[in-house]
């Protein structure tokens, strides 16, 4: 009678394996083993039995000992199962971006592996499983199909392969192939927004807006504005499923005519674009021309406005005479003239919207200074003691440098509150100075003091104010 | 050009009498006030007194009595008359163009002033 | 009577220092004080009147400020021709004064 030992063995591909032949009987003719698989044989003491070394298994095998005994022969098989994992484990490549709605097929290859019956295929989303297959075929293929969702975004997609050898003693093999991240995105069927000046000035900066609405994920939607061949640089602001691009376009004198301004937006493989057309114009504001800007009371003044040949021109509300591009006016100077605005309004059309421009240029005249009594009262008369503020104002452009002095170095505090007292009294030149000259004007002060007198046989206090005037002899002095 | 310009100054005995004068240039004694301004060695500036253009006078309460300032408007000339002199009125004296405005010449005038000495 | 008091009597200063000297009117003065810098053995100059305009060749380093009976002469970045003795002066009245000037400041090097 043959046996063989181990009946069963499961070993890793090309490994090697001790299978010991023994037989019954003690004096066999025969004793040996019958493989393809290279063979050692280990000397042992006795007749009965024999040990190999079988080496370099690759597949599954069923080497057969026999023995040749008077009895007669016989013959016991090992069962030899070889494992591995797989060569190769797979998603079959997809495009990155997938629209949300969208049914997306997963598709995992795996090429090799035993043994067959213990290794399995499992699709998975991140640790879910989304299908679980035995491994059949070479290679083995296992599909499903996925409704792309928002909430997939960013999502990995993997193929796993088990080979689970803990029936036999082994552990469980998994390989992984390298993940699918999934980049999901929404873009709307409606173009963008674009907000932006239907016409723009040469020399100038206008703001130009694109917006859309209902983007997923908003933080991947590129946008691309330019106008004409000039690419913009926006500011892109976003919210929750939305953006605003912003940006400004500078124009120059090579741009004027019709340029075309776009907004195209780009998420994932789709885009959408908005064409709108801008018109590009020249128009300097009118020319406000003063024969001089600053003038003497009395002096012929002439005022001109000229703007652009197309455009219609008003001088201080008054319209040119005929309608046209040029308006003048005359007039002689006068101090109610200083400060006066010309104004001069001109108007274009540009592509159906109508362009106004303002110039304005101020007239100054000189004139003064003045001093005047409704101005600088010429007399005061204060009581003694009391609080009062010497009012004085001189009038001319520039504005006079007023000082009010008495005997030539003492200062009335114009425009001051002050205690009136006795050394406030006097008679003072009060001086307004400027470019345009001079004028002085004489000013008194008289202050009133009690005069106290004593009734008969009586301490009774009749409180008389007496008004005492002093008048000095001022020459054309000016003092701090 | 404007000019203030003291002299008299020098060597005086106590209880004598000095009189100090200003001569100007460049303007006219009947449109400014004068002023003198005392300053005593390693002191501080004293203001002594002024005359307005009326020729009315102002002091200091220290220096009514013994002080004394006059004008000579045909001499354009400002005095400064120190009765009974002591030994405390040792100083420099300066003479001052009072009135000042932007219009003016762009600084108040002040003479180089001229050292009196009081001793016996 | 209107004394004028001026503070601090001496200041020590580096180039390149903000000094502020002040001056102190017994009673208001409004805005008719001026300033003065002298040098030894030299005339007062003249730098600032209506207590901050500044007089012709002066400096823009130099500034005046107040009104009533508190001023203030700054001096935003001394320079070395800038130490010197400075004086203040009331040019408001004449009733019976001691003296029209503060008492001097003298600006020092540190």
């Known amino acids: 009678q043959t046996s063989v030992s181990p009946s069963k063995v499961i070993l890793p591909r090309g490994g090697s394996v001790l299978v010991t032949c023994s037989t019954s009987c003690d004096q066999p003719k025969l004793l040996g083993i019958e493989t393809p698989l290279p063979k050692k044989e280990l000397l042992l003491p006795g007749n009965n039995r024999k040990v190999y070394e079988l080496s370099n298994v690759q597949e599954d095998s069923q080497p057969m000992c026999y023995s040749n005994c008077p009895d007669g022969q016989s013959t016991a098989k090992t069962f030899l199962t070889v494992y591995w994992t797989p060569e190769r484990v797979e998603l079959a490549p997809l495009p990155s971006w997938q629209p949300v709605g969208k049914n997306l097929t997963l598709r995992c290859q795996v090429e090799g592996g035993a043994p067959r019956a213990n290794l399995t295929v499992v699709l998975l989303r991140g640790e879910k499983e989304l299908k679980r297959e035995p491994a059949v075929g070479e290679p083995a293929e296992v599909t499903t199909t996925v409704l792309v969702r928002r909430d997939h975004h960013g999502a990995n997609f993997s193929c796993r392969t088990e080979l689970d050898l803990r029936p036999q003693g082994l552990e469980l093999f998994e390989n992984t192939s390298a993940p699918y991240q999934l980049q999901t995105f929404v873009l709307p069927a409606t173009p963008p927004q674009l907000v932006s000046p239907r016409v723009l000035e040469v020399d100038t900066q206008g703001t130009v807006v694109c917006s859309l609405d209902g983007l997923f994920p908003v933080s991947e939607a590129q946008v691309h504005l330019a106008l004409g061949d000039q690419r913009l640089n926006p500011t892109v602001t976003y919210g929750n499923d939305s953006f605003s691009a912003k940006a400004s376009v500078s124009v120059t004198a090579e741009d004027e005519g019709t340029q075309r301004l776009t907004c195209a937006v780009i998420l994932g493989n789709q885009s959408q674009e908005t064409l709108q057309t801008v018109t590009i114009y020249s128009f300097p504001a009118p020319n406000v021309i003063l024969t001089k800007p600053e003038v003497s009371e009395g002096t012929e003044v002439t005022v001109k406005c000229e703007a652009h040949p197309r455009a219609k021109v008003t001088l201080n509300g008054v319209p040119a005479q005929p309608l046209g591009p040029r308006a003048q006016l005359l007039l002689k100077a006068t101090p109610e003239d200083n400060g006066r605005s010309f104004s001069c309004s001109a108007t274009l059309e540009v592509a159906g919207q109508l362009i106004h421009k303002n110039q304005t240029r101020e007239l100054r005249v000189l004139y003064g200074p003045r001093l005047d009594e409704r101005d600088c009262p010429g007399n005061w008369t204060w009581p003694e003691n009391s609080q009062q503020t010497p009012m004085c104002q001189a009038w001319g452009n520039p504005l006079p440098e007023l000082k009010c002095l008495k005997d030539g170095t003492f200062p009335l505090p114009i425009g001051e509150s002050v205690t009136v007292t006795r050394d406030l009294e006097g008679t003072y030149l009060c001086r307004a100075r400027s470019t345009q000259g001079e004028v002085t004007r004489k000013v008194t002060v008289n202050v009133l003091s009690p005069r106290y007198e004593g009734g008969s046989g009586g301490s009774g206090l009749n409180d008389i104010f007496e008004a005492q005037k002093i008048e000095w002899h001022e020459e054309n002095l000016y003092f701090q | 050009e404007v000019q203030v310009l003291e002299s008299g100054g020098g060597l005086v005995q106590p209880g004598g009498s000095l009189r100090l004068s200003c001569a100007v240039s460049?303007?006219?004694?009947?449109?400014?006030?004068m002023g003198w301004v005392r300053q005593a060695p390693g002191k501080g500036l004293e203001w002594i007194g002024i005359i307005g253009s009326s020729d009315r006078t102002y002091y200091a309460s220290w220096a009514k009595g013994r002080f004394t300032i006059s004008k000579d408007n045909s001499k354009n000339t400002v005095y400064l008359q120190i009765n009974s002199p002591r030994a405390e009125d040792t100083a420099v004296y300066y003479c001052?163009?009072?009135?000042?405005?932007?219009?003016?010449?762009?600084?108040?005038?002040w003479g180089q002033g001229t050292l009196v000495t009081v001793s016996s | 009577d209107i004394q004028m008091t001026q503070s601090p009597s001496t200041l020590s200063a580096s180039v390149g220092d903000r000094v502020t000297i002040t001056c102190q009117a017994s009673?208001?003065?409004?805005?008719?004080l001026s300033w003065y810098q002298q040098k030894p053995g030299k005339a007062p100059k003249f730098l600032i009147y209506d207590a901050s305009k500044l007089a012709s060749g002066v400096p823009s380093r130099f500034s005046g400020s107040g009104s009533g009976t508190e001023f203030t002469l700054t001096i935003s970045s001394v320079q070395p021709d800038d130490f010197a003795t400075y004086y203040c002066q009331q040019a408001y009245s004449s009733g019976s004064i001691d003296n029209a000037f503060g008492g001097g400041t003298k600006v020092e090097i540190k």
């Open positions: 009673q208001s003065i409004y805005r008719y």
């Open positions: 001052v163009r009072d009135p000042y405005d932007s219009y003016d010449d762009g600084y108040r005038l």
């Open positions: 460049g303007f006219s004694l009947s449109s400014h006030a």
